[in-house]
């Protein structure tokens, strides 16, 4: 008689109850609810992966002052307005110098481009060539050439326009972008690659990430340097350096400034010009930032033919005169002398001013320092984030080396860069500390990075995203297979149905169990008698 009790309660609860209509209906509804819930959730999450993702491509030529770099980007066609899906698949540096150096021979620009463009053709499937947009953006080198000789600048751009007519891509134009655009696009790139704009929530909808801080961007080119960041509350909104940037329906109040002539190469020319101005001898000078046992001769034209140094020309200027700079590798003197290329006095100790009288709100949040900043830190054997002390001691150590030791310190030795890293490091110190007002406490918030994943941090990605409308101002968010309100409603309805059925079945189970229990108790009493 007792063996019956070894069965599971619901089983025991009976075979009779199972045949009752309400139970069957409840079980069916429960089953259907579970199937529907699982189905719509799976569809909502995985629907986008059902179709084989066709790829789209975009090409940007970053025509910098010292070189042109070609970037190829790709993204899944059906995720056009998603964030974080564009990745860099190829990068090619055009041989020779920047396009601004072709002012006297614009017809030679295309020949320089051809080798990289041939490689690019191999990176993009041929059937997509015609629909692949290609953009050329020229930066500070061409901004300077345009100021110096507008006709020459236009001829260079015309030569490029003409060349791209022969290429099998959808050429969208060659433009000289402003310093402000360069800064904003660099900031967009950094934050896009770091996933700071949007994130996917549980239902695979793109939402603004809660509490995520954007990253400031510090870019160092050959002819200009840019700073861009979302500033705090206290801001002079009347300055042209404050921009309202609307991305995915979220408005960012961005401070961005481009310092023309403060790119690495032009800043060094300013430095050499300053050394010449302050030297008693005009043809043989010492340079505390060049390594010991290193000397180099330049023509006066090399230093003074730039718009950035034209006002520092000596009275008896002859572009063909030769000047020799002898390196003394003196870290403290180098640091002291480099400060003089900045006009810090113009700020009159104002907190909201960087240098040369330029307005800047108080720096805020983390920063990514890329391009020339990264390469200089890398030469000092530094990357990522580190303390100001570490940066200073590495700079001191590097600047103390003599010329013959540098090839041992630098994995990629190139004379032009190697001789100037000491200058660059001291330049970065003054720019960041005395200019942008980074302190010992805030310096570790600067991350010196070259790329995120396999994508270079450069203004070019932000430029392409903007020009191909991949970052809409409004919040398009992704089109889901089931619209969010319908999805949530369906989810709520079937969850409620499932819970009700479970409650009903549980009630039936317990009721039947109670009934069986009383019957067993009665049987037991009879047996014992």
């Amino acid at each position: 008689m007792f063996t019956v009790l070894t069965r599971q309660p619901c089983e025991q609860a009976g075979l009779k109850a199972l045949y009752r209509t309400p139970t069957i209906i409840a079980l069916v509804v429960l089953l259907v609810s579970i199937v529907v819930l699982v189905s719509i959730t799976v569809i909502q999450i995985h629907k986008q992966e059902v179709l084989p993702p066709g790829l789209k491509y975009g090409i940007v030529l970053d025509a910098g002052s010292s070189r042109t770099t070609v970037y190829v980007y790709q993204w899944p066609a059906e995720k056009e307005n998603n964030t974080g899906v564009v990745s860099q698949t190829f990068k090619c540096s055009v041989k020779g110098s920047g396009i601004s150096s072709y002012g006297n021979n614009p017809q030679d620009v295309p020949r320089a481009f051809e080798e990289c463009m041939q490689k690019v053709k191999g990176q993009v499937p041929s059937h997509l060539h015609g629909s692949t947009p290609i953009h050329l953006g020229a930066t500070a080198g061409m901004r300077l050439l345009r100021l110096q000789n507008e006709t020459a600048a236009n001829e260079v751009l015309e030569s490029i326009q003409s060349y791209f007519k022969s290429q099998p891509f959808d050429f969208r134009g060659a433009q000289i972008i402003s310093g402000q655009e360069e800064g904003v696009y660099g900031w967009i790139t950094a934050n896009y690659l770091m996933g700071n704009f949007l994130e996917k929530n549980l239902w695979h909808m793109w939402v603004h990430p809660h509490g995520v801080e954007t990253t400031g961007a510090l870019d160092l080119g050959g002819a200009s340097t840019q700073i861009s960041f979302v500033a705090g509350e206290k801001m002079d909104l009347n300055t042209s350096d404050i921009m309202q940037v609307s991305l995915y329906g979220y408005v960012y109040t961005l401070y961005t400034h481009s310092f023309q002539c403060y790119g690495r190469n032009e800043a060094e020319k300013k430095f050499l010009a300053m050394l010449l101005q302050n030297s008693p001898t005009k043809n043989h000078l010492t340079n505390p930032c060049y390594p010991r046992d290193y000397s180099i001769s330049f023509t006066m034209g090399h230093v003074f033919d730039s718009l950035c140094t034209v006002d520092q020309r000596p009275e008896s200027y002859n572009p063909n005169d030769v000047i020799t700079f002898e390196g003394t590798g003196d870290p403290s003197l180098c640091k002291e002398k480099v400060a003089s290329i900045f006009d810090f006095k113009a700020c009159h100790d104002q907190e909201t001013c960087s240098f040369d009288g330029v307005y800047q709100p108080k720096i805020k949040g983390p920063f990514v320092a890329f391009a020339g900043f990264y390469y200089t830190a890398s030469a000092l054997n530094l990357s990522g984030s580190f303390s100001l002390d570490t940066f200073n001691s590495s700079t001191w150590n590097f600047c103390s080396q003599n010329w013959s030791q540098l090839p041992l310190l630098l994995p990629k030795f190139d004379e032009v860069y190697a001789r100037s890293y000491c200058f660059s490091a001291n330049y970065i110190y003054h720019l960041f500390v005395n200019g942008y007002k980074f302190t010992e406490e805030t310096w570790p918030q600067i991350h010196f990075e070259k790329e995120v994943g396999n994508s270079s941090i450069a203004w070019s990605l932000g430029y392409m995203l903007s020009l191909t409308n991949q970052i809409p101002a409004e919040s398009p968010l992704i089109r889901l297979p089931i619209e969010p309100p319908v999805f949530v409603g369906t989810l709520a309805f079937f969850t409620a149905a499932a819970l009700l059925c479970l409650a009903f079945l549980a009630y039936l189970c317990s009721a039947t169990r109670r009934k069986r229990h009383s019957e067993h108790a009665f049987d037991h009493a009879v047996d014992s008698d």
């Epitope: 295309p110 020949r111 051809e114 041939q118 003409s162 007519k165 959808d170 050429f171």
Partner: antibody, heavy 120, light 112 residues
Framework: EVQLVQSGAEVKKPGSSVKVSCKAS????????ISWVRQAPGQGLEWMGG????????NYAQKFQGRVTITADESTSTAYMELSSLRSEDTAVYYC?????????????WGQGTLVTVSS | KIVMTQSPLSLPVTLGQPASISCRSS???????????LNWFQQRPGQSPRRLIY???NRHSGVPDRFSGSGSGTDFTLKISRVEAEDVGVYFC?????????FGPGTKVEIK
């Protein structure tokens, strides 16, 4: 005056290849784009591809990609178009044409045309 | 790729009378440099094509002034002010603004 002189008519078997030449005279050869255009009997014009001799690399229309090879010999100012895996529908007059301004496919000057007949 | 369409495909004309051929592109032909690379070619019977008009309205050297081109964006027209016997042939429009260059199907001009 720019002149483009093409090689003579060809009769080819299906599956074989044909190579047509185009010799330029008058003006600079290297810097101007040379295009190849074909015209099937009683049909319209179809751009096949082109080359800028100074670069030495050709660009092809998608339809002909992988089957056509365009080359240029700067020393003889001659451009060549080779079409492989011939089929009967490749029977056409093949023209070379040259632009007058730099790098575009403007087709200012035309050769006399080369009739290629594909027949078994 | 850009599709070029022409109308009419056949145009019977009377000597001395004007003639007009229309050409339409599936996309705007304004190139990034601001120019519109739309050309017109004439192909007389048994001859190679020759360029009549470039960049919409510019006559190629040696082309009689009775030929004129006009239009913008996606709609273009070739006009012959007074048709002469030597104008018989097929007229093609061709775009060079977008890759790859493409031709219209041609308009056959014949004397009535």
């Amino acid at each position: 005056e720019v002149q483009l002189v093409q090689s003579g008519a060809e009769v080819k078997k299906p599956g074989s290849s044909v190579k047509v030449s185009c010799k330029a005279s008058g003006g600079t050869f290297s810097s101007y784009a040379i295009s190849w255009v074909r015209q099937a009997p009683g049909q319209g014009l179809e751009w096949m591809g082109g080359i800028i001799p100074i670069f030495g690399t050709a660009n092809y229309a998608q339809k002909f990609q992988g089957r056509v090879t365009i080359t240029a010999d700067e020393s003889t100012s001659t451009a060549y178009m080779e079409l492989s895996s011939l089929r009967s529908e490749d029977t056409a007059v093949y023209y070379c044409a040259r632009g007058a301004s730099g790098y575009d496919w403007s087709l200012d000057y035309w050769g006399q045309g080369t009739l290629v007949t594909v027949s078994s | 790729k850009i599709v070029m369409t022409q109308s009419p495909l056949s145009l019977p004309v009377t000597l001395g009378q004007p003639a007009s051929i229309s050409c339409r592109s599936s996309q705007s032909l304004v190139y990034s440099d601001g120019n519109t690379y739309l050309n017109w070619f004439q192909q007389r019977p048994g001859q190679s094509p020759r360029r009549l008009i470039y960049k919409v309205s510019n006559r190629h050297s040696g082309v009689p002034d009775r030929f004129s081109g006009s239009g913008s964006g996606t709609d273009f027209t070739l006009k012959i002010s007074r048709v002469e016997a030597e104008d018989v042939g097929v007229y093609f429009c061709m775009q060079g603004s977008r890759w790859p260059p493409t031709f219209g199907p041609g308009t056959k001009v014949e004397i009535k």
